[in-house]
């Protein structure tokens, strides 16, 4: 239904609070380096000018489309072509192409500081001073970090993180109260912006196709007992959401979320018995509830795929008569059955079930070629199967810290191009697998593991297409969203490497290593790591693992003498002249 | 630990009939769909049946259709394949297996694998 007045319509919908949150990490998302203030008041200014038209739609400029009325007022930036270059070319352009020209220019990895955690007492001071500047700064700085953050998802962040501080701050002992909160905060947060990252990455690189598709096959894991017809309906509104959000259409976004969420509510009896619970909870969390609720029971009786998708003489007549809801209806049927498989296991099911479909009906007995269609899916069960099963059985034998050196080695070895702090920051997350997935059954193990993976793999990707240096990461991200892991994993070490120099200052730590925590310290050693990995990518495990057991020594020597640094300086020299001996440099 | 034991082979002349039973123990029998393959001398084992959780469901090889019935019992934690019509060409050992999830009833599916009870038939 066509509105006078869009910018009033989803003001309206949304409440004050809500369109200025918005209206800021849209803002935030697009001007990742303006400062605080100058996002304030602009979005002061759009809601002030929202205000005029929810009074009267008619009045000026009130008609144009949000994209036109949040561009212009970007546009307005006066600093806009020192701090973003060629970004400010983007306001030459008429909309849609201004807004795509601002999309393309979201940077996955901002030039920005750290974000330092202040004191628990300064933090209460500023919540309790100006808890609404506190909590837009929030909201600021996590947006212009994670440009791609689910907007709605990010109001029930900024819901719980007020909360967090409204009950420590009067706690007796404020930090034991708040810090947890805080970290769980974190890793949650960190997690949710690349799972959504992965869902724009589907939408903007393989197309609304890829992305219905996967989203068939999770609803149908999530909702068996709900009809095709329903699941599709679900489909469709979730696509509309996410590509909404992906596309910068914050308001819009949150608006059907919204919307979605109050269907499902309303209609929970056809589509889960799980999602009772949810839905007796306020909007936001109700909103992310669902989202995280837990598969359904499965129908007691489900029959064989067989009749329906092999031996029916109508397979061919049925797939030529409307493709994708046939394939469809496969993905439907084959995911409601199997949640104990990975989406993208699913989704390369599917495709070679479509692939064997193209090539046999057009075959002169169809029936006889795509008659052991099945029997071709083995294979590609049994690969994730063993791969996950392989790697949890290391993963128990290690623990966390080596598994992921373990995988460090085994990444850089693969891709030695890719910028250290990029492997680093990856195979870390990669190594998390083990303590997020491994614990559970076997059934559970598949969809946690490799769903995880796609994620993970997905942060490589986009963090590599910004600055391209790996022809075979380029080949592993582009050619297939569902193939990419086991593209990677399916890499062997890169011959045509050349072994980068050695450089003794890459090596060269200092006293403050002492004072970090125990995972910054860590990131020390597994940067050291990739680096003896580039310097000698033939190096055997037991050649690395010795060199760092004495790097491990060294540290811990120079952390408990009385003049540290002069330790770290001469027992340095040392280190480096026998890792370079035990390493043939 | 789950088991799952068959009982009921033997040798049967051409035309005969047999009864194959598996006892089900260690698992939750009625979150499990249930199925029959067979590995004849040298050859790759194949799917012959498979049954539902519920029993609503079955699904038969074009080999023994007409001629072999999979039945259950959740409360008897068994399942039985009843063969008509033998021939030779159904010599092999049979095995019973359990499914927690079940689309296409084909090998890779199945969780759990009994050790298999020989059929011969003679000509």
């Known amino acids: 239904d066509a509105h006078k007045s869009e910018v009033a319509h989803r003001f309206k919908d949304l409440g004050e609070e809500n369109f200025k949150a918005l209206v800021l990490i849209a803002f935030a998302q697009y001007l990742q380096q303006c400062p605080f203030e100058d996002h304030v008041k602009l979005v002061n200014e759009v809601t002030e000018f929202a205000k005029t038209c929810v009074a009267d739609e008619s009045a000026e400029n009130c008609d144009k489309s949000l994209h036109t009325l949040f561009g212009d007022k970007l546009c307005t930036v006066a600093t806009l072509r020192e701090t973003y270059g060629e970004m400010a070319d983007c306001c030459a352009k008429q909309e849609p192409e201004r807004n795509e020209c601002f999309l393309q220019h979201k940077d996955d990895n901002p030039n920005l500081p750290r974000l330092v955690r202040p004191e628990v007492d300064v933090m209460c001071t500023a919540f309790h001073d100006n808890e609404e500047t506190f909590l837009k700064k929030y909201l600021y700085e996590i947006a212009r970090r994670h440009p791609y953050f689910y907007a709605p998802e990010l109001l029930f962040f900024a819901k719980r993180y007020k909360a967090a501080f409204t009950e420590c701050c009067q706690a007796a002992d404020k930090a034991a109260c708040l810090l947890p909160k805080l970290d769980e905060l974190r890793d949650e947060g960190k997690a949710s912006s690349a799972k959504q990252r992965l869902k724009c990455a589907s939408l903007q690189k393989f197309g609304e196709r890829a992305f219905k598709a996967w989203a068939v096959a999770r609803l149908s894991q999530r909702f068996p007992k709900a009809e095709f017809a329903e699941v599709s309906k679900l489909v469709t509104d979730l696509t509309k959401v996410h590509t909404e959000c992906c596309h910068g259409d914050l308001l819009e976004c949150a608006d059907d979320r919204a919307d979605l969420a109050k269907y499902i509510c309303e209609n929970q009896d056809s589509i889960s018995s799980k999602l009772k619970e949810c839905c007796e909870k306020p909007l936001l969390e109700k909103s992310h509830c669902i989202a995280e609720v837990e598969n359904d029971e499965m129908p007691a009786d489900l029959p064989s795929l067989a009749a329906d998708f092999v031996e029916s003489k109508d397979v061919c007549k049925n797939y030529a008569e409307a493709k994708d809801v046939f394939l469809g209806m496969f993905l439907y049927e084959y995911a409601r059955r199997h949640p104990d498989y990975s989406v993208v296991l699913l989704l390369r099911l599917a495709k070679t079930y479509e692939t064997t479909l193209e090539k046999c009906c057009a075959a002169a007995d169809p029936h006889e070629c795509y008659a052991k269609v099945f029997d071709e899916f083995k294979p590609l069960v049994e690969e994730p199967q063993n791969l996950i099963k392989q790697n949890c059985e290391l993963f128990e034998q290690l623990g966390e810290y080596k598994f992921q050196n373990a995988l460090l080695v085994r990444y850089t070895k693969k891709v030695p191009q890719v910028s250290t702090p990029t492997l680093v920051e990856v195979s870390r997350n990669l190594g998390k697998v083990g303590s997020k997935c491994c614990k559970h059954p076997e059934a559970k193990r598949m969809p946690c593991a490799e769903d995880y993976l796609s994620v993970v793999l997905n942060q490589l990707c986009v963090l590599h297409e910004k600055t391209p240096v790996s022809d075979r990461v380029t080949k592993c991200c582009t050619e297939s969203l569902v193939n990419r892991r086991p593209c990677f994993s399916a890499l062997e070490v890169d011959e045509t490497y050349v072994p980068k120099e050695f450089n003794a200052e890459t090596f060269t730590f200092h006293a403050d290593i002492c004072t970090l925590s125990e995972k910054e310290r860590q990131i020390k050693k597994q940067t050291a790591l990739v680096e003896l990995v580039k310097h000698k990518p033939k190096a055997t495990k037991e050649q690395l693992k010795a060199v760092m057991d004495d790097f491990a020594a060294f540290v811990e020597k120079c952390c408990k003498a009385d003049d540290k640094e002069t330790c770290f300086a001469e027992e340095g020299k040392k280190l480096v002249a026998a890792s370079q001996a035990a390493l043939g440099l | 630990d789950v088991q799952l034991v068959e009982s009921g082979g033997g040798l049967v002349q051409a035309g005969g009939s047999l009864r194959l039973s598996c006892a089900a123990s260690?698992?939750?029998?009625?979150?499990?769909?249930m199925g029959w393959f067979r590995q004849a001398p040298g050859k790759e084992r194949e799917r012959v049946v498979s049954?539902?959780?519920?029993?609503?469901?079955?699904y038969y090889a074009d080999s023994v259709k007409g001629r072999f019935t999979i039945s259950r019992d959740n409360a008897e934690n068994t399942v039985y394949l009843q063969m008509n019509s033998l021939k030779p060409e159904d010599t092999a050992v049979y095995y019973c297996?359990?499914?927690?999830?079940?689309?296409?009833?084909?090998?890779?599916?199945?969780?759990?694998w009994g050790q298999g009870t020989l059929v011969t038939v003679s000509s």
């Open positions: 297996a359990a499914a927690r999830y079940w689309a296409t009833g084909s090998e890779y599916e199945f969780d759990y």
């Open positions: 260690g698992l939750t029998f009625s979150s499990y769909a």
């Open positions: 049954i539902s959780r519920g029993g609503g469901y079955t």
